[in-house]
């Protein structure tokens, strides 16, 4: 399987909400011995390998924001910790998973990474990630709502296995 990022750039006005999205593509094993760990984190723009560094999102680590479930099951973070920070991560039946950030500030600008880890019990893990940039703007040229820029096909299906 691989991870696609439908949009590589989100440009939003401060105060707005945004939902960053990744999509799980390809055959997904739905066996009982397979679970998926999905999460989000910030990263610096690595010149060698994007998303190699894991930084918190609004002080919440990737462990705080994770979803853990089987196959294409739906899930979302309901814990108060994330919501108190204006964050919610979610996953649907179609392989889409997202993080919603509320009341954006200029501090939220940066590179965001989604991470999927396929965990096969008694076997190895398979990790893939996707990256996208969020620019929060202020002033007269800031859009009234978030504007999204599609990834190129090459970028949107960028596989990084670890």
């Amino acid at each position: 399987f691989k991870v696609a990022t439908p949009y590589s750039l989100y440009v939003c006005p401060e105060g707005q909400n945004v939902t960053l999205t990744c999509r799980l593509l390809g055959p997904v094993d739905k066996g009982h011995d397979v679970t998926f760990y999905k999460t989000w984190y910030r990263s610096s723009r690595g010149e060698v390998q994007t998303c190699s560094e894991r930084r918190p999102i609004r002080n919440l680590t990737f462990q705080d924001l994770h979803l853990h479930h089987g196959g294409h099951q739906a899930a979302n973070t309901s814990h108060d910790l994330a919501q108190r920070h204006g964050l919610e991560s979610a996953s649907d039946h179609h392989g889409n998973f997202s993080i919603t950030m509320r009341n954006l500030t200029l501090l939220d600008s940066g590179l965001y990474c989604c991470l999927v880890v396929e965990i096969r019990h008694h076997h190895s893990e398979h990790r893939v990630h996707g990256a996208m940039e969020l620019q929060v703007q202020t002033g007269k040229d800031a859009p009234s709502n978030c504007v999204v820029y599609p990834s190129s096909s090459q970028d949107s299906e960028n596989i990084t296995a670890a």
């Epitope: 723009r45 501090l107 600008s109 002033g139 007269k140």
Partner: antibody
Framework: QSVEESGGRLVTPGTPLTLTCTAS????????MTWVRQAPGKGLEYIGI?????YTYYASWATGRFTISKTSTTVDLKIPSPTAEDAATYFC?????????????????WGPGTLVTVSS | DVVMTQTPASVSEPVGGTVTIKCQAS??????LAWYQQKPGQPPKLLIY???TLASGVPSRFEGSRSGTEFTLTISDLECADAATYYC??????????FGGGTEVVVK
């Protein structure tokens, strides 16, 4: 369009000081504004920014040492307890290039600066 | 914080010569970098933004470029009026709007 700083003077250590940046020819609700300082013979040092929406953000070293606020026509920089290290020329600048408010394009419109001297 | 390391601290070249100033970011900041020129007693003047875009009115003798996390300001066909201190400036994040240490350019 222009910006001009005022309020710089000689103060004794610990005496609160407020610097004011007055904007002319444009609206502060359209642009983020920033404060930068420069000690005599030294380089430029970023202090913080106030967004068009009125949110304030500070360089890590400046948090707690300065307060930025604004009205419809002015942006203030408050130095609650100046020390000798705070002696510098303080510049106010509009963020963005030319008429653009894009915060990634640098600081385009600068004031001439106002000098703060701290001495007992 | 992103640290901007600017070199050299000072450079001296004759009229008509070429000066190269480098700025190294401690981490990737994409192309979010600006260059300023400052003359004594004056505020800085924006020369280049987004690493390589010339501000209006700036002569094409000034050129900005990027290679990874290293940024370069090149001034060719030096003129006496180019004598000033030049600063790079990370514009990637409002927390990291940090400046380089500056480079004094002396035109002989």
């Amino acid at each position: 369009q222009s910006v001009e700083e005022s309020g710089g003077r000689l103060v004794t250590p610990g005496t609160p000081l407020t610097l004011t940046c007055t904007a002319s020819g444009f609206s502060l609700s359209d642009y983020a504004m920033t404060w930068v300082r420069q000690a005599p013979g030294k380089g430029l040092e970023y202090i913080g920014i106030i967004s068009a929406g009125g949110y304030t953000y500070y360089a890590s070293w400046a948090t707690g040492r300065f307060t930025i606020s604004k009205t419809s026509t002015t942006v203030d920089l408050k130095i609650p307890s100046p020390t000798a290290e705070d002696a510098a020329t303080y510049f106010c600048a509009r963020v963005g290039y030319a008429d653009s408010s894009d915060i990634y394009k640098g600081f385009y419109l600068w004031g001439p600066g106002t000098l703060v001297t701290v001495s007992s | 914080d992103v640290v901007m390391t600017q070199t050299p601290a000072s450079v001296s070249e004759p009229v008509g010569g070429t000066v190269t100033i480098k700025c190294q970011a401690s981490e990737s900041i994409s192309n979010y970098l600006a260059w300023y020129q400052q003359k004594p007693g004056q505020p800085p003047k924006l020369l280049i933004y987004l690493a390589s875009t010339l501000a209006s009115g700036v002569p094409s003798r000034f050129e900005g470029s990027r290679s990874g996390t290293e940024f370069t300001l090149t001034i060719s066909d030096l003129e006496c009026a180019d004598a000033a201190t030049y600063y790079c400036h990370c514009t990637d994040s409002i927390i990291n709007y940090n400046f380089g240490g500056g480079t004094e350019v002396v035109v002989k």
